[in-house]
Interface confidence: low
């Protein structure tokens, strides 16, 4: 028989106490300690160096304590794919930069997603046709601009349609073709800052007789030999919080799977051997699961619906956990600063 | 009514098919694609640059394919705490290096665990007492050795008990005391290589009048001002596989929660837009859960036993998942190399 007023409160209180006990045993187990080091508050005072490195650790590192987390904090997107390399093929340029239909090559398109990444490396790759004998080749990259009225015949160069952005002297020895890479990071930064300035580029690679060895024609017959841009990027994987789990408080009447607040207070345990944090927010999961409610893996419900022999249904469990930083005395009276994984419940779900 | 022969086989086959479908939808969703890019095998051949960076990606990165994983591979220890900083307090030296009971300071003890870490930084911190007026202080660190019979009075120095390993000239201005740090990485390396050579050190810091300003007495009255060693370490978190989950094969009669093999073949889907891998091992979870069997969080069973309103019991679900690397065409005919999280089931458990 459940007490009046709050039928789920007794259960929740029980969960809370069990979670606290479990946290104590987990900390000892994760720190590889058989029992709590026997270090009193007085001994801590004697042993704790009044020295810069300790202060630095305490200042620099977030020991979570009672710091409030803003509700709309950015969190790691652990669901979507992260992009590491983008290879963008050369496309035809805009007619505005073409004279008599040339140059058709090369424009490179970048999505807004790529433009908001940190570019670690950007290289333009150009295929140079084979030369019959060793030769010095001068490769140049010209940045295209639409032709403006002024400066066409004479003038101060304000209307220049081509601006050289890279030049390279290459010694070719091979009778087979050669892929040449050109660092393009600076140019890319300027394009990403001002996407409207990206009208494309022209690529030439002249040998001493003036023959252009660069494969830039985008027509058939040169499959796989067209210029392309290789980007190594670092994504900002912080995304605004995707509310994938319910958050409740102690007064909630929610019966579904939910995350509840729980503060662990080490001083209340009498654990003086933990220097920092003195307390932290651990949280816990509690509540019922329906088949289709908030599953960790989107496909789980399908499997479960068809499951004649598995468990009766999904369970309310942490689907995302995070570590805490801890500064503590070990059983040899050494001070250790480290990270204990899986000590904070960030999200609850049915899985 | 279950078919004869293998009562769980039909369920498993169902799980398998659902997991495959789920993987397809997850890949598209995680790559932020509304549908599979419409790129045929012929178009792939045309667009794919025959160029070094593509080859490099294919050579350098593990696309998992059909590569067999050795059963006893090392995996990340995601359970135990990782140590980042160790602060080791000065202790009394061994009597073998003391003459007339001195020097008592300083010996530093390091556990085998710390000795097997990579030491990024090692600093000895020494507190220097305040000086009444600005002064030049000569700080020296002597490495102690046990006194051997030969060469005690004079001689060739073979029996020398002190070897200077650090000397430092410090300009002191402050009327308050001063913490001085001394780089100790090289000494530490030699101690870690030959622990038997660590007999401790003696520290002096003499002002022009010959007063030793270094606080080295380990008795009371100088709490928090004793010398200590600060180490920044990088642990090898790879541990031999802890078998926290059962592995089964299709012919197994295991009814408990278990991990089953499942190979995803993109060519069989007709997904030519995925350049690599062409296939990968995804695995899936299936089976029954008892209260106390293989729970993800050691304390879960306590909460569940007392749960009058939660799910009927824990469920068989992935407790560790890992990403796959993928090289693919997106919907803009760009080639992307990236990582898709949570695509391989590494471990199943009841949680």
């Amino acid at each position: 028989p459940e007490p009046d007023g709050c039928p789920v409160c007794v259960w929740r209180q029980h969960s809370r106490e069990l979670r606290l006990e479990s946290i104590k045993s987990q900390i000892l187990s994760k720190l590889r300690l058989k029992e709590a080091p026997n270090i009193s508050r007085e001994v801590v005072k004697q042993l704790l160096p009044k020295a810069p490195p300790l202060q630095q650790i305490l200042d620099l590192h977030d020991f979570q304590g009672d710091a409030l987390q803003p509700e709309d904090f950015l969190e790691e997107d652990e669901y979507h794919a992260t992009t590491e390399t983008v290879i963008s093929m050369a496309q035809e340029t805009d007619p505005a930069v073409q004279t008599d239909g040339s140059p058709l090559c090369c424009h490179f398109h970048f999505s807004p997603k790529v433009m908001f990444t940190k570019v670690l490396k950007a290289q333009l790759w150009v295929y140079l046709r084979p030369v019959p004998r060793p030769a010095t080749v001068y490769l140049q990259i010209l940045r295209l601009k639409p032709l403006t009225g002024e400066g066409t015949a004479g003038g101060g160069g304000g209307g220049r349609r081509h601006i050289r952005i890279r030049s390279l002297k290459i010694e070719l020895h091979s009778r087979s073709g050669h892929w040449q890479s050109i660092d393009f990071k600076q140019v890319l930064h300027s394009w990403f800052r001002q996407p409207q300035s990206n009208w494309g580029i022209e690529i030439n690679a002249f040998d001493p007789s003036g023959t252009d060895l660069a494969v830039t024609s985008l027509g058939p017959g040169a499959e796989g030999l067209h210029p392309f841009m290789e980007l190594r990027v670092l994504e900002n994987t912080k995304r605004s919080r995707r509310n994938l789990g319910l958050d409740c408080d102690e007064h909630s009447s929610e019966s579904r799977c939910c995350r509840y607040p729980l503060t662990v207070d080490f001083e209340a345990f009498g654990w003086d051997w933990i220097i920092a944090p003195k307390r932290y927010k651990a949280n816990y999961c509690s509540g019922q699961c329906e088949y289709m409610f908030m599953q960790k893996y989107p496909h789980t419900h399908l499997v479960q619906q068809a499951n004649p022999r598995g468990s009766a249904g999904p369970c309310c469990t942490p689907t995302k956990m995070s570590p805490i930083n801890m500064l503590y005395f070990n059983d040899k009276q050494q001070i250790i600063y480290g990270k204990i994984p899986g000590m904070v419940v960030d999200r609850c779900g049915c899985s | 009514p279950e078919p004869d022969g293998c009562p769980v086989c039909v369920w498993r086959q169902h799980s398998r098919e659902l997991r495959l479908e789920s993987i397809k939808s997850q890949i598209l969703s995680k790559l932020r694609l509304k549908e599979a890019p419409n790129i045929s095998r012929e178009v792939v051949k045309q667009l794919l640059p025959k160029a070094p960076p593509l080859q490099q990606i294919l050579d350098l990165h593990d696309f998992q394919g059909d590569a067999l994983q050795p059963e006893d591979f090392l995996e990340e220890d995601e359970y135990h705490a990782t140590t980042e900083t160790v602060i080791s307090m000065a202790q009394e030296t061994d009597p073998a290096v003391q003459t007339d009971g001195s020097p008592l300071c300083c010996h530093f003890h390091f556990s085998p665990k710390v000795m097997f870490t990579k030491v990024l930084k090692a600093q000895l911190w020494v507190y220097l007492r305040p000086v009444p007026r600005p002064a030049t202080v000569y700080l020296q660190i002597l490495r102690l050795k046990p006194l051997t019979g030969e060469g005690t009075a004079g001689g060739g120095g073979g029996g020398r008990r002190h070897i200077r390993i650090r000397s430092l000239k410090i300009e002191l201005h402050s009327r308050s005391g001063h913490w001085q740090s001394i780089d100790f990485k090289q000494v530490l390396h030699s101690w870690f290589r030959q622990p038997q050579s660590n007999w401790g050190i003696e520290i002096n810091a003499f002002d022009p009048s010959g007063t030793d300003l270094a606080v080295t007495s380990l008795g009371p009255g100088a709490e928090g001002l004793h010398p200590f060693m600060e180490l920044r370490v990088l642990e090898n978190t790879k541990r031999s596989r802890r078998n926290l989950g059962l592995d089964c094969d299709e012919h197994s009669s295991e009814s408990r929660c278990c991990r089953y093999p499942l190979t995803v073949d993109f060519e069989a889907f007709g997904w030519d837009w995925i350049i690599a891998p062409k296939r990968y091992k995804a695995n899936y979870c299936s089976g029954q859960c008892e209260y106390m069997f293989m729970q993800k969080y050691p304390h879960t069973h306590l909460v569940q036993q007392a749960n009058p309103r939660g799910s009927a019991g824990p469920c068989c679900t992935p407790t560790k998942m890992s990403p796959i690397n993928m090289l693919y065409f997106n919907d803009k005919q760009q080639i992307i190399y990236g990582k898709i999280p949570g695509m391989v089931v590494d471990r199943c458990g009841c949680s």
Epitope: G157, E202, N204, F206, G210 | -
Partner: antibody, heavy 123, light 107 residues
Framework: QVQLVQSGGGVVQPGRSLRLSCAAS????????MHWVRQAPGKGLEWVAV????????YYADSVKGRFTISRDNSKNTLYLQMNSLRAEDTAVYYC????????????????WGQGTLVTVSS | EIVMTQSPATLSLSAGERATLSCRAS??????LAWYQQKPGQAPRLLIY???NRATGIPARFSGSGSGTDFTLTISSLEPEDFAVYYC?????????FGGGTNVEIK
Amino acid sequence: QVQLVQSGGGVVQPGRSLRLSCAASGFTFSSYAMHWVRQAPGKGLEWVAVISYDGSNEYYADSVKGRFTISRDNSKNTLYLQMNSLRAEDTAVYYCAKDFWSGYPQYNWFDPWGQGTLVTVSS
Amino acid sequence: EIVMTQSPATLSLSAGERATLSCRASQSVSNYLAWYQQKPGQAPRLLIYDASNRATGIPARFSGSGSGTDFTLTISSLEPEDFAVYYCQQYGSAPLTFGGGTNVEIK
């Protein structure tokens, strides 16, 4: 072997005109921008004008703008400098020079140079 | 326009000595700088381009360095044929401009 051979220099009175020529060989003339550079007696070098590989673009130093015209005939592999309204300060050795790069007029360095031709403007 | 200033105007050295020629731009030209050698009665000859790249056929004793506004041409050990006038030239922006030259003469 890349070569530039100049002709057309001489003595001319102020206000008169003169045309310089520069015959190119040993490279694809029609692929390269070309320049004129001059050097007054005992003085340094001064860039005069540039023309694009196809003759569609040309640029001039302020000191000659409106008086000099650079042109080319790709069928004859020849570069020209038409100098009108000549002044005493135009007295110099005039060099034609191949732009190091091909294509549109870039502001570049020169390799090789012609042997030079002396223009003396004097009454 | 960008003004190029070379120093010293004259450098008197003996064969085998090291020559260091300086060129300063009135504003940054990145690495868009060339060096030329000119002997009496001859056309200039390209030595260095892009501040530090030796042109084809130029001996290794010639080297260029610098970027932005300050550049140096170094001849590690003077040969008799190296005594000449040296010019720097910027091609960072229009119009192209040359320095006044440094005359390297035999001491």
